[in-house]
Interface confidence: low
Amino acid sequence: EVEKTACPSGKKAREIDESLIFYKKWELEACVDAALLATQMDRVNAIPFTYEQLDVLKHKLDELYPQGYPESVIQHLGYLFLKMSPEDIRKWNVTSLETLKALLEVNKGHEMSPQVATLIDRFVKGRGQLDKDTLDTLTAFYPGYLCSLSPEELSSVPPSSIWAVRPQDLDTCDPRQLDVLYPKARLAFQNMNGSEYFVKIQSFLGGAPTEDLKALSQQNVSMDLATFMKLRTDAVLPLTVAEVQKLLGPHVEGLKAEERHRPVRDWILRQRQDDLDTLGLGLQGGIPNGYLVLDLSMQEALS
């Protein structure tokens, strides 16, 4: 065992090159100088090291930089980044957007891993702010990242970033966030034709105001119930029975199943019962026939 730790004669690495792929793990450990590895990290990614060999290289870097890697090394980690744990990454101070891009590229096409989440957390905290370039980068790699931002942070997201968003990326957005994202989406998709526009805007409608819902009801969009249930209650309440019927099209029948849930429940309470009866769905809870409906919001505006 003792002699195995010494580098065999003539095997000492002078540079990081492809010859190293033929080294056994112990030879890499013994024959590759950690400082040399650190200065030539950019070459590692081009060499088809095995996962076991990458473990050795990581171990060497860990010994050289016990307090965390410098950014010059981090930027060139390449696939070695996949070997890092969140604990390793917490030691880093990443301030360059180029470094962030390089590491996100390694994980491209995969879900956001704990490593990536930690990296982004370190980056944002290291920079002290979420500037437009950072947001552009993060939303390009992880459109779903939008939903982890506060409305204030979202206010600096350019509408161009919205194009990369898939419906599932907005699953974790709450109404506050959709209030900010919806106008951007409306702007981004405004030049599309009716049916194409609805397909793109649908995921953002949780932030839509009443007047936009009224406009959509005139376009034969056939909104599904799942989308309708995510609409803002205050935006749905002023819609008439006829407008909801046009908005939902054949999906209007689904209102019965949702009559006890918001926003359907609250909307029903605002409608005349005889109007609800025209739907033929047996929806109950509307304003009884013959009752006077006072528009209190209009009354407040006048007083």
């Epitope: 704990p114 982004i120 957390d121 944002v124 702010q129 506060s150 204030e152 699953d171």
Partner: antibody, heavy 118, light 107 residues
Framework: ELQLVESGGDLVKPGGSLKLSCAAS????????MSWLRQTPDKRLEWVAT????????YYPDSVKGRFTISRDNAKNTLYLQMSSLKSEDTAMYYC???????????WGQGTTLTVSS | DIQMTQSPASLSISVGETVTITCRAS??????LAWYQQKQGKSPQLLVY???NLADGVPSRFSGSGSGSQYSLKINSLQSEDFGTYYC?????????FGGGTKLDIK
């Protein structure tokens, strides 16, 4: 070292008002959302208010909406909570906390005590 | 509002043992969950965010797991400094609410 230090807690009569302050240091205050939380005598934790980094957005639970106002002075690295129409159920230890990258709270102050009693 | 239910409410356990605390949300919170530790007379401290991510400086004996509406915090080989009260908190839209807490006592 990251630090949040609350002050201003007191004994107040029901219906009264009080303003709490939180002095922040050790991080870029103006880049972080901030919150007030409270812990009632029975040890329950409740979120009270949140303000975004630039101070343009504020959020409150229904229990304090219209009575409490969160604000911040980024030049002074200070967070405030103005409380009015106080009720006995507002009696609690009040903490200021920094918002993480999501809406969790990654650093808390040591707290300041508000007692509402006649 | 989303209700967070923690169990058990209290637990007596010995140093070196493993403990699991659970938190149930009244609806799907999509991993939007944090765990905090609070020691007697101190303020809460973040342990875990987004269900599984350990906060800075938290020992690796702590781990978070779960999805949908069910989450848990596991502490392996309990140390004396781990005793205190643990809270879960969802951040799936306002109002953000906390569980009632789980008090960990030394047996």
């Amino acid at each position: 070292e990251l630090q949040l230090v609350e002050s201003g807690g007191d004994l107040v009569k029901p219906g009264g008002s009080l303003k709490l302050s939180c002095a922040a240091s050790g991080f870029t205050f103006s880049s972080n959302g901030m919150s007030w939380l409270r812990q009632t005598p029975d040890k329950r934790l409740e979120w009270v208010a949140t303000i975004s980094s630039g101070g343009r957005y504020t959020y409150y639970p229904d229990s304090v909406k219209g009575r409490f106002t969160i604000s911040r002075d980024n030049a002074k690295n200070t967070l405030y909570l103005q409380m009015s129409s106080l009720k006995s159920e507002d009696t609690a230890m009040y903490y200021c906390a920094r918002r993480g990258i999501y809406d969790y709270f990654d650093c808390w102050g040591q707290g300041t005590t508000l007692t509402v009693s006649s | 509002d989303i209700q967070m239910t923690q169990s058990p409410a209290s637990l007596s356990i010995s140093v070196g043992e493993t403990v699991t605390i659970t938190c149930r949300a009244s609806e799907n919170i999509h991993s939007s969950l944090a765990w905090y530790q609070q020691k007697q007379g101190k303020s809460p401290q973040l342990l875990v965010y987004a269900a599984t991510n350990l906060a800075d400086g938290v020992p690796s004996r702590f781990s978070g797991s779960g999805s949908g509406s069910q989450y848990s915090l596991k502490i392996n080989s309990l140390q004396s400094e781990d005793f205190g009260t643990y809270y879960c908190q969802h951040f799936w839209g306002t109002p953000w609410t906390f569980g009632g807490g789980t008090k960990l006592d030394i047996k």
